[in-house]
């Protein structure tokens, strides 16, 4: 399955929007910094077949979409930017979903892919717990925004590598 060219443009737009969403200086939130243990090894693109990589990317975007679709998120960000960001993620989800279905049809997830999906889920669990512990403070959201920018950059790079493999 070839992801449409608009997909990579959507990735870039999502990153730009997320950058624009920053409301407070990252430096004023240094005390709140946290290592969420992003599962880099799941995004290096070496141990995967393309199909499996797309499933993991889908999980990544889906969890990001869910994180920014909460009431707490709505209260934290400028509404029009948040809506545009969510729209970009939703479009990416549609592209990836179509690819997962096209590549293998609806079937059981390959065993080697199961732990990668769980690793992504656990990463977002750590982010969710951090926000809860910090009572969704502005600095906590700023730390999370910066973290998601980093993880989306990894996703974008993996997708570039997948396109080069084609």
């Amino acid at each position: 399955c070839d992801l449409p060219q608009t997909h990579s443009l959507g990735n870039r737009r999502a990153l730009i929007l997320l950058a624009q969403m920053g409301r407070i200086s990252h430096f004023s939130c240094l005390k709140d910094r946290h290592d969420f243990g992003f599962p880099e090894e799941e995004f290096d693109g070496h141990q995967f077949q393309k199909t499996q990589a797309i499933s993991v990317l889908h999980e990544m975007i889906q969890q990001t979409f869910n994180l920014f679709s909460t009431e707490d998120s709505s209260a934290a960000w400028e509404q029009s930017l948040l809506e545009k960001f969510s729209t970009e993620l939703y479009q990416q989800l549609n592209d990836l979903e179509a690819c997962v279905i096209q590549e293998v049809g609806v079937e059981e997830t390959p065993l080697m892919n199961v732990d990668s999906i769980l690793a992504v889920r656990k990463y977002f669990q750590r982010i969710t717990l951090y926000l809860t512990e910090k009572k969704y403070s502005p600095c906590a959201w700023e730390v999370v925004r910066a973290e998601i920018m980093r993880s989306l950059s990894f996703s974008t790079n993996l997708q570039k590598r997948l396109r080069r493999k084609d």
């Epitope: 499933s55 889908h58 889906q62 969890q63 979409f65 869910n66 679709s69 989800l93 990836l96 979903e97 997962v100 279905i101 609806v106 079937e107 059981e108 997830t109 199961v114 732990d115 769980l118 889920r121 656990k122 977002f124 669990q125 750590r126 969710t128 717990l129 809860t132």
Partner: antibody, heavy 119, light 108 residues
Framework: QVQLVQSGAEVKKPGASVKVSCKAS????????MHWVRQAPGQGLEWMGE????????IYAQKFQGRVTMTRDTSTSTVYMELSSLRSEDTAVYYC????????????WGQGTLVTVSS | EIVLTQSPATLSLSPGERATLSCSAG???????LYWYQQKPGQAPRLLIY???NLASGIPARFSGSGSGTDFTLTISSLEPEDFAVYYC?????????FGQGTKLEIK
């Protein structure tokens, strides 16, 4: 509010198959994995597997591999769990439970569907 | 597979007393992925505590959770009549996800 409504009780003969449905409402159906958990009479809870309603990919517990099939219909926001080659030990209440994160993990359950396997 | 063993199987106490329920894991479970559920007869399980020690929405403060590694505890500080039920610990730290066999909390 989030609601998961399951199909009614079933009685099946050994060797037959059963298909239980779980209709979701009150949230975006394709955003969350749906899990199936069963409970034999007087026994504990047992995780069977999960399905991503967005693209339909599944993850099954090894114990049920080859006998369980989870599917979904996005047009009706419904997930299905089919169990084949039924035996008496499969007599249980089958629950669907919605995934999520933090306080949302298995925070929402269907009411349960009793499947009785008897000759 | 991570086996969760709950003890005791049955706990007989009176309202007002303190209840301590244990959950022992066969191998280490990250505390972020250890949950507790309450189940009453004829009902679906209900989320009580998530990530070892966090109270789910609407759960009274008399419930608390603690632990790490392989040993986890659910404590009910002062039992109310509605607390008598079966309690399950659950992990989703690794596949397959598992539940303990349950502790039945009954009125003495």
């Amino acid at each position: 509010q989030v609601q998961l409504v399951q199909s009614g009780a079933e009685v099946k003969k050994p060797g037959a198959s059963v298909k239980v449905s779980c209709k979701a409402s009150g949230y975006t159906f394709t955003n969350y994995w749906m899990h199936w958990v069963r409970q034999a009479p007087g026994q504990g809870l047992e995780w069977m597997g999960e399905i991503n309603p967005s693209h339909g990919r599944t993850i099954y517990a090894q114990k049920f591999q080859g006998r369980v099939t989870m599917t979904r219909d996005t047009s009706t926001s419904t997930v299905y769990m089919e169990l084949s080659s039924l035996r008496s030990e499969d007599t249980a209440v089958y629950y669907c439970a919605r995934g999520g994160l933090g306080p949302a993990w298995f925070a929402y359950w269907g009411q349960g569907t009793l499947v009785t396997v008897s000759s | 597979e991570i086996v969760l063993t709950q003890s005791p199987a049955t706990l007989s106490l009176s309202p007002g007393e303190r209840a301590t329920l244990s959950c022992s894991a066969g191998s280490s479970v990250d505390s972020s992925y250890l949950y507790w559920y309450q189940q009453k007869p004829g009902q679906a399980p209900r989320l009580l505590i998530y990530s070892t020690s966090n109270l789910a929405s609407g759960i009274p403060a008399r419930f608390s959770g603690s632990g790490s590694g392989t040993d986890f505890t659910l404590t009910i500080s002062s039992l109310e009549p509605e607390d008598f039920a079966v309690y399950y610990c659950h992990q989703w730290s690794s596949y397959p996800f598992t539940f303990g066999q349950g502790t039945k909390l009954e009125i003495k």
